[in-house]
């Protein structure tokens, strides 16, 4: 199971002191940004228990493997479901904590219920503040069951769930009718996917017999150990105040794990830490009890004393869970609870034992999951122990599972189960990815998806020229960094392959599929210079350039002209695709603009040095707007426009352009040319009667100028529908005389 713990601080006098911390003991947990370790996520899940909105909660990351949620401002902020997600890929795991209000009408006798498939689960809500009304049970936020308030038994409302199946898992709540949901009792039901003591796809495999309240995971058969216990079967107690799969974490604060709720991956759920009990985990275990929630009884024999954190502490000469085994009985010593090897390796496994009489080589054996017994090939005898060494035959995947070291002497026997994980060396499923290329180097991303097992310890990149029979060149790189292959030949195809390794002997995987990466052509070295340029209009520029004369063929495919408009912060690029070209016409430029111009030779995707820049000013565009535009209706189909010439003209006007549009109309406007630029009046004919029109105009010299103000005018009367506007110019005086 993933080493992930969600801690809730239950000292509830002040919600502002409340916090949730998610701790991961996984290698590389929570690093986030890279492909090898997604981040730890810790959040309130409002899908089922909705609380009034408040200020956002604060998330603080403490290093790579811890994240804390604070910022609770009122007790109602705490009520509900919180989740922490950690682990990578298929091991991504969600740990859930359910928080009940201590002032609720109903309180759960026990929040987390872990049951086996087919069992009967009983949820019990204790009456804290009585209401004489129905009690509504919900499952994952949806209605589930109703109880009459008279159905309480000993001040408790019970929900019986017979023959539970995994889909029955989830958040259950009991609420008085017409009471606030925050006054509900919230429960978490976890239904294992198998019957008691079984695990695996068809529930055909037998659980290892988890001790000290550990729960057998229905998918992988591992024991999820209560906080404060470790080992394959949770057989070993941590020191007081420690938790995590290897007891590597320490409870914060001076009072150790008091007042903390620990939530672990399903199917464990949540409990107090070892040595503590009660709804707020603030009560020490009663004498004779120990472990998480004080659920375990010591029953020590032979003078053993009960420690509320670890169970029986045996006097000299005795050992065992209840101090029931004499030290004369042989004992397996310091056996690792879990070992990891790579597929097809032939590891050596050591097993040490002590006892009276002293164990010898033949009295220690190793049993594989399939029942095969291995005898030791050599033994090291020391005054206090015998260590047997076993040479394991080439490992196959079926060797994964629980192995057992067993010692037998005339004084008795002892055995210790330990888990062997046979890991498959990683094999890339895809070829590496080319990021950038130059003429003599390739930058490659070696990070690819792979089959088999991580973590990835090293990445080897093998490369050689395509179709070559020479030896492969190899470079060893860090898994998370891009690789630069250097000193390559220009314009050459290289076959590149990735090989991944995981930790341990035999961890090198097979080479991944090859990919072809080609180096770029040589960089062009010649620097052109600008010979000259001239303006061919307000938006057109002709540019010419030269290249230095050098012996040999020209290394280049064409030229790139760049125009930089500093005022607008815009760059225009023009590609001239002939290396023989020495001139180009640039069109569509912005009139009246200062440009910085340069030219450079290119070859393939590589650019040579740019020419010294030139500064070019294009002449401004057309004239200013006509002034004092005025419209006057003459009839039901004619409107006369009058205006004054623009001021400060840069040259003679070639024509005017009038824009006509029906007011509020959705169609395109109509443009009409006034080809006699000396005139200051025109009549627009063919308009519709009683129709409101919009007019504006502009002058043209080399280009069109600015628009005048817009004027509105309506045609008169109620004549016939016209065919469309036309224009007739007159001298202004003549139009006014009429």
């Amino acid at each position: 199971a993933v080493d992930l713990t969600l801690l809730a601080n239950l000292r509830l006098t002040d919600p502002q002191r409340f916090f949730l911390t998610c701790v991961s003991g996984e290698a590389g947990a929570g690093r986030g940004s890279d492909a090898w370790g997604p981040p730890l996520l810790l959040e309130k899940d409002d899908r089922i228990v909705r609380t009034p909105p408040g200020p956002p909660l604060r998330l603080a990351r403490n290093g790579s493997h811890q994240v804390t949620l604070r910022g609770f401002s009122k007790p109602s902020d705490l009520v509900g479901v919180f989740s922490c997600v950690g682990g990578a890929g298929a091991r991504r795991t969600r740990v859930i904590y359910v928080h009940n209000s201590p002032g609720a009408h109903l309180l759960p006798d026990k929040v987390t219920h872990t049951v086996n498939k087919g069992d009967t689960a009983v949820l019990s809500a204790r009456v804290h503040k009585e209401k004489q009304t129905d009690v509504i049970w919900k499952s994952n936020g949806s209605y589930f069951y109703t109880l009459d308030w008279h159905e309480a038994q000993d001040g408790r409302f019970l929900l019986q769930l017979p023959n539970v199946q995994p889909p029955s898992s989830g958040i259950y709540s009991a609420t008085y009718l017409e009471a606030s949901p925050l006054g509900s009792a919230f429960f978490r039901l976890i239904v294992r996917g198998c019957g008691a003591g079984r695990w695996g796809p068809g529930c055909t495999k037998e659980c290892p017999g988890c001790l000290h309240g550990g729960v057998c995971h229905d998918h992988d058969g591992e024991c999820v150990c209560p906080p404060g216990f470790t080992g394959t079967r949770c057989e070993q107690a941590c020191r007081e105040g420690r938790f995590g799969q290897s007891c590597q974490e320490q409870c914060p604060g001076i009072s150790g794990c008091r007042g903390l709720t620990f939530c672990l991956p399903d199917p464990y759920g949540c409990s107090c830490g070892s040595g503590w009990r009660g709804s707020q985990c603030q009560e020490a275990c009663a004498p004779g009890h120990f472990g998480a929630d004080c659920r375990l009884q010591c029953q020590c024999q032979n003078g053993g004393t009960c420690d509320r954190f670890s169970g029986c502490v045996c006097p000299s000469g005795w050992h065992g869970v209840h101090c029931e085994k004499s030290d004369r009985i042989p004992q397996i010593l310091n056996m690792a609870s879990e070992l990891e090897f790579n597929l097809e390796t032939m590891p050596r496994i050591n097993c040490a034992a002590a006892g009276n009489p002293f164990p010898v080589r033949g009295s220690i054996e190793l049993r594989k999951p399939d029942g095969t017994v291995l005898l030791s090939t050599k033994a090291i005898v020391e005054p206090e122990k015998t260590t047997a060494e076993f040479e394991v035959p080439r490992l196959v995947l079926a060797d994964s599972g629980f192995w057992e070291c067993r010692v037998s002497t005339s004084g008795g026997q002892d055995s210790r189960r330990f888990k062997v994980n046979v890991k498959v060396p990683p094999v890339p499923l895809a070829a590496p990815r080319l990021l950038t290329k130059q003429s003599r180097q390739l930058v490659v991303s070696p990070l690819v998806s792979f089959s088999g097992d991580g973590p990835i310890s090293t990445v080897r990149l093998h490369y050689r020229p395509q179709d070559s029979t020479m030896d492969w060149s190899t470079i060893v790189v860090d898994p998370s960094e891009n690789v630069t292959l250097m000193n390559l030949r220009p314009k050459t195809g290289y076959s590149v392959r990735v090989q991944l390794s995981r930790p341990g002997e035999g961890g090198e995987g097979a080479w991944g599929p090859p990919t072809l990466m080609t180096t770029d052509c040589p960089e062009p070295l010649l620097q052109p210079w600008l010979e000259g340029w001239h303006v061919e209009g307000t938006d057109r520029l002709r540019v010419s350039w030269s290249l230095p004369l050098v012996p040999g063929p020209l290394v280049g495919d064409g030229f790139l002209l760049r125009l930089w408009d500093g005022t607008r912060g815009q760059e225009r690029r023009e590609n001239v695709s002939s290396p023989q070209a020495r001139t180009a016409l640039l069109t569509g430029l912005t009139p009246g603009t200062h440009y910085q111009l340069d030219v450079q030779l290119y070859h393939c995707t590589l650019l040579g040095p740019a020419s010294p820049p030139a500064h070019v000013l294009l002449p401004p565009s057309g004239p200013p707007a006509p002034r004092h535009l005025h419209a006057q209706a003459l009839s039901d189909s004619e409107i006369q426009l009058t205006w004054k010439h623009p001021e400060a003209l840069p040259g003679p006007i070639s024509k005017y352009v009038v824009e006509v549009q029906v007011a509020g109309g959705a169609g395109d406007p109509l443009w009409i040319d006034v080809d006699r630029p000396e005139e200051t009046s025109t009549i627009i004919r063919g308009l519709n009667a009683s129709t409101r029109y919009l007019f504006r105009m502009r002058a043209s010299i080399q280009g069109l100028g600015d628009w005048s103000n817009t004027v509105e005018e309506s045609t008169l009367g109620n004549g016939l529908q016209a065919e469309g506007p036309v224009q007739e110019s007159r001298a202004a005086e003549e139009g006014l005389d009429q």
């Epitope: 004489q132 009304t133 129905d134 509504i136 209605y143 589930f144 069951y145 109703t146 109880l147 009459d148 008279h150 159905e151 609420t175 008085y176 009718l177 017409e178 009471a179 606030s180 949901p181």
Partner: antibody
Framework: EVQLLESGGGLVQPGGSLRLSCAAS????????MGWVRQAPGKGLEWVSS????????RYADSVKGRFTISRDNSKNTLYLQMNSLRAEDTAVYYC??????????????WGQGTLVTVSS | QYELTQPPSVSVAPGQTARITCGGN??????VNWYQQKPGQAPVLVVY???GRPSGIPQRFSGSNSGNTATLTINRVEAGDEADYYC???????????FGGGTKLTVL
């Protein structure tokens, strides 16, 4: 699809008895509080009785208390109303209805089509 | 026993807004449900818990509840809305359901 189908209505003399049934389908009948609501001809709706999922607890309107008995058979997904000592004012269409809870408030979300009970000599 | 009072009838032109009231002592602290019943048919829930709308009920139907009056509002009334409308509360004091006398909505 939730369905409620009443049966058992008919003509009965004053003082007589009748047993109404309501067959439920499309939901987990044993989890829901159920009830009977009636409507006299040309009149409004009147709640008659309710029963809790377990079947052990019931409620009655004052007008029928002591004469009517509500019951259920969760194995058959059926609700019953045993009506004794019938009176002319019990003449009505009797509807079977499911009680539902949204947030923490009750309402009748599904109704049957009703069965007519006529009490007349 | 708790009592609910509704006007016997309300008339409204198509496209207008109809408001049907339901009076009861301090009804604002209770949760009110509204049912629509067309002739010869079973009642249909149109608003629950004062203002909740079941799926399939048009957005034109809405509810409110405060003080001594709960109100069912039907915007842009259609001919198909013509029916009897009943308000209903759960009287936790007597553990009984209580219905209003019903209001006949006529679309002119």
């Amino acid at each position: 699809e939730v369905q409620l189908l009443e049966s058992g209505g008919g003509l009965v003399q004053p003082g007589g008895s009748l047993r109404l049934s309501c067959a439920a389908s499309g939901f987990t009948f044993s989890h829901y509080k159920m009830g009977w609501v009636r409507q006299a001809p040309g009149k409004g709706l009147e709640w008659v009785s309710s029963i809790y999922p377990s079947g052990g607890f019931t409620r009655y309107a004052d007008s029928v208390k002591g004469r009517f008995t509500i019951s259920r058979d969760n194995s058959k997904n059926t609700l019953y109303l045993q009506m004794n000592s019938l009176r002319a004012e019990d003449t009505a269409v009797y509807y079977c209805a499911r009680n539902f809870v949204e947030s923490s408030h009750y309402y009748h979300d599904y109704w049957g089509q009703g069965t007519l009970v006529t009490v007349s000599s | 026993q708790y009592e609910l009072t509704q006007p016997p009838s309300v008339s409204v032109a198509p496209g207008q807004t109809a408001r049907i009231t339901c009076g009861g002592n301090n009804i604002g602290i209770k949760s009110v449900n509204w049912y629509q019943q067309k002739p010869g048919q079973a009642p249909v829930l149109v608003v629950y818990d004062d203002s909740g709308r079941p799926s399939g009920i048009p957005q034109r139907f809405s509810g409110s509840n405060s003080g001594n009056t709960a109100t069912l509002t039907i915007n842009r009334v259609e001919a198909g809305d013509e029916a009897d409308y009943y308000c209903q509360v759960w009287d936790s004091g007597s553990d009984h359901w209580v219905f209003g006398g019903g209001t006949k909505l006529t679309v002119l």
